[in-house]
């Protein structure tokens, strides 16, 4: 039976231009992460494999940085990374944990003056 | 198998700078955070800070921004430490220490600086 | 930054004996803290990693709980092989941090 929970960052906002940490934690459950999967939508951004390390695609390799620890830090936000993100957290023996976090990247001055999302 | 190669001991005098260097092997450089701790005499440990060799990012622990700086080179898979306008209290051991899905499961024996005139 | 504090700074115990060491931190790190041991002359070695995720080649008498900002370290049974220095380190956020450790000594 599968008893972790994946705890994200939620909905979160960032300026454009700028840097955003996305975040998932895996609790409740002793089962062993092999890999963690970061992915846009249905596009691959980046992979932490216990034996082999991190994999960035190619092409986000220029703008995705691996960390802090499972994380996964976008640099240099532009309008178009607005939308969901999700973190797959491969385990033994529980299977497959999926977590979401939304990201809006607004202009700099809607930004400064209150974004619809806060990091919780 | 994974190794992490530091050099015994570095002996330099009061102001000058050192290159303490770390070479890995065993694994794809690339793919794995590289980090730095520091450990004087009898205390405890240190961050200073990382790299990922994949892309020359760094981070720093804010106390070392100004004394050390972070480098690679992914053709012989070594990792860098530049230490500078050195004093006493860089004198400590200094390792090296990987990281992937976690933290730090291989370390070097460490480089011993020793600051003196 | 986040800061962990151990507890005790020093331990005198006796081969046999089973012992909790303390490690708080200063904020939620929420399961991103790991244990290491540091014998004399030696360099650190992973015991732990996320809490309590036991690490290949380490006995089974050292096991960790806690979660949020309160964690722990249990050593059943204490072999004179496990008397050192222990850390507790977050990989939370950065700038990593380690705490002060704590030194279990033989009684």
């Known amino acids: 039976m599968m008893t972790g929970t994946i705890e994200t960052t939620g909905n979160i906002s960032a300026e454009k231009g700028g840097s955003i940490i996305l975040q998932c934690h895996l609790s409740s459950t002793t089962a062993q992460v092999t890999q963690v999967n970061w992915e846009q939508q249905d596009q691959l951004l980046a992979i932490c494999n216990a034996d082999l390390g991190w994999h960035i695609s190619p092409s986000f390799k220029d703008r995705v940085a691996p960390g802090p620890g499972l994380g996964l830090t976008l640099q240099s936000l532009t309008v178009n990374d607005t939308g969901e993100y999700f973190c797959i957290y491969h385990t033994y023996p529980d299977g497959t944990y999926t977590g979401r976090i939304f990201l809006e990247v607004l202009e700099s001055s809607v930004a400064e003056h209150g974004a619809r999302f806060q990091i919780p | 198998q994974v190794q992490l190669q530091q050099p015994g001991s570095e002996l330099v005098r009061p102001g000058a700078s050192v290159k303490l260097s770390c070479k890995a092997s065993g694994y794809t450089f690339t793919s794995y955070w590289m980090h730095w701790v520091k450990q004087r005499h009898g205390q405890g440990l240190e961050w200073i800070g990382n790299i990922y060799p994949g892309s020359g990012t760094t981070n720093y622990d804010e106390k070392f921004k100004n004394k050390g700086t972070l480098t690679v080179d992914t053709s012989s898979s070594t990792a860098y430490i530049h230490l500078s306008s050195l004093t006493s209290e860089d004198s400590a051991v200094y390792y090296c220490?990987?990281?992937?899905?976690?933290?730090?499961?291989?370390w070097g024996q460490g480089t011993t600086l020793t600051v003196s005139s | 930054d986040i800061v962990l504090t151990q507890s005790p700074a020093t331990l005198s115990v006796t081969p046999g004996d089973s012992v909790s060491l303390s490690c708080r931190a200063s904020q939620s790190i929420r399961n991103n803290l790991h244990w290491f041991q540091q014998k004399s002359h030696e360099s650190p070695r992973l015991l732990i990693k996320?809490?309590?995720q036991s690490i290949s080649g380490i006995p089974s008498r050292f096991s960790g709980s806690g979660s949020g900002t309160d964690f722990t370290l249990s050593i059943n049974s204490l072999e004179t092989e496990d008397f050192g220095m222990y850390f507790c380190?977050?990989?939370?956020?950065?700038?990593?941090?380690f705490g002060g450790g704590t030194k279990l000594e033989i009684k």
């Open positions: 220490t990987r990281e992937g899905l976690y933290p730090f499961d291989y």
């Open positions: 996320y809490v309590f």
């Open positions: 380190q977050q990989s939370n956020s950065w700038p990593y941090t």
